[in-house]
């Protein structure tokens, strides 16, 4: 590539997304994002689900969405396999309902290659430990 | 029960500081970002700042920035927005509020903050 | 800046109607569009969050929806505690941007 030639991937700035396998992302992102500020912003709606322990793939999953993985090799970016999403829904989603909140439509698991492949590359994430919840107490209105 | 109580509101002149307090109980604002949110007397609502400690990040309206900083003493379960060079159209009451994934699901009463000499 | 144009400014209605507000964003904010109510002197309050998501321990007679940019908040009888000011707010990038506000009135 030559100098002159935009850089294709720019460094993650966002610290929770840091450190966890990749580093380098492009904008927009999958749900529409320019900015990396305006993608924090929605990853901050979600802290209280990640500090509650759902899933060990949760926070791999949403910076796979809003910081997806960029390669200089291609020129689309790499979110998440559908079978990340889907493992992080089965065990986030009752949580959120707990709450008496509905699963988010951007993170639609159907959006996603089912699985990772030369036509639809994605990241299976880090493995899912298959235990119960655990029993914490969830970060909800009226408790510490 | 979930509580923000505001404070440090009052009359200050043209140019003066202001620190507003916000003290949470009932939850951890480590895992909710804190924004500030103002209205000035018979307008509508204006976001003035965010904290997201657990990030680390900040943000601001451009009507604050560099005069306005926002921080949170999370042993305290405190958050705070620090109001410098202050002017006549800061004139406004300040509400805190949780942000997480509904919105701003839970607000302070209010802290009145009047800039006038 | 994403700007959220609110309609109307103010209405006047009766017990019973049904009221309807729109918003309409300067840009695309995805489902990321909260509703609240506010009365004089008070905090405001969350009504619907994602744009058509009813928020906890709020009455069913208000609903929101979205098409495109355009967002609309529904409420489907008014009833007495219901006369106040609604506000849209946007939270898909910063500044976060509220609305002017809806004043709904008795008639």
């Known amino acids: 590539f030559g100098d002159e030639e935009e850089r294709r991937c720019d460094p993650i700035r966002i610290s929770m997304c840091q450190n966890l396998g990749y580093n380098v992302t492009k904008m927009p992102n999958l749900v529409g994002h320019e900015l990396q500020t305006d993608a924090e912003l929605q990853l901050t709606t979600f802290t209280p689900l990640i500090q509650y322990g759902c899933s060990s793939q949760l926070q791999f999953f949403l910076c796979s969405v809003y910081v997806p993985m960029c390669t200089e090799k291609i020129n689309i970016p790499i979110g998440p396999c559908g079978g990340m999403c889907l493992s992080v829904k089965r065990r986030c989603e009752p949580v959120l309902k707990e709450f008496g909140f509905a699963w988010p439509e951007s993170l639609n698991c159907s959006k996603f290659p089912p699985q990772n492949d030369h036509n639809h590359m994605c990241m299976e994430g880090p493995g899912d430990e298959e235990v119960p919840l655990p029993h914490k107490t969830p970060i909800q209105p009226g408790e510490e | 029960e979930v509580q923000l109580v505001e404070s440090g509101g009052g009359l200050v002149q043209p140019g003066g500081s202001l620190r507003l307090s916000c003290a949470a109980s009932?939850?951890?604002?480590?895992?909710?970002?804190m924004h500030w949110v103002r209205q000035a007397p018979g307008k509508g609502l204006e976001w003035v700042a965010s904290?997201?400690?657990?990030?680390?990040?900040?943000s601001y309206a451009d009507s604050v920035k560099g005069r306005f900083t926002i921080s949170a003493d999370t042993s305290k379960n405190t958050a705070y927005l620090q109001m410098n060079s202050l002017r006549a159209e800061d004139t406004a009451v300040y509400y805190c509020a949780r942000f997480w994934y509904p919105g701003m699901d839970y607000w302070g009463q209010g802290t009145l903050v009047t800039v006038s000499s | 800046d994403i700007q959220m144009t609110q309609s109307p400014s103010s209405l006047s209605a009766s017990v019973g109607d049904r009221v309807t507000i729109t918003c309409r964003a300067s840009q695309s904010v995805s489902s990321a569009v909260a509703w609240y109510q506010q009365k004089p002197g008070k905090a405001p309050k969350l009504l619907i969050y994602s744009a058509s998501s009813l928020y906890s321990g709020v009455p069913s007679r208000f609903s929101g929806s979205r098409s495109g940019t355009d967002f609309t908040l529904t409420i489907s009888s008014l009833q007495p505690e219901d006369f106040a000011t609604y506000y849209c707010q946007q939270h898909w990038s910063y500044p976060i941007t509220f609305g002017q506000g809806t004043k709904v009135e008795i008639k």
């Open positions: 904290i997201s400690s657990y990030y680390s990040s900040t």
């Open positions: 009932g939850f951890n604002i480590s895992y909710y970002s």
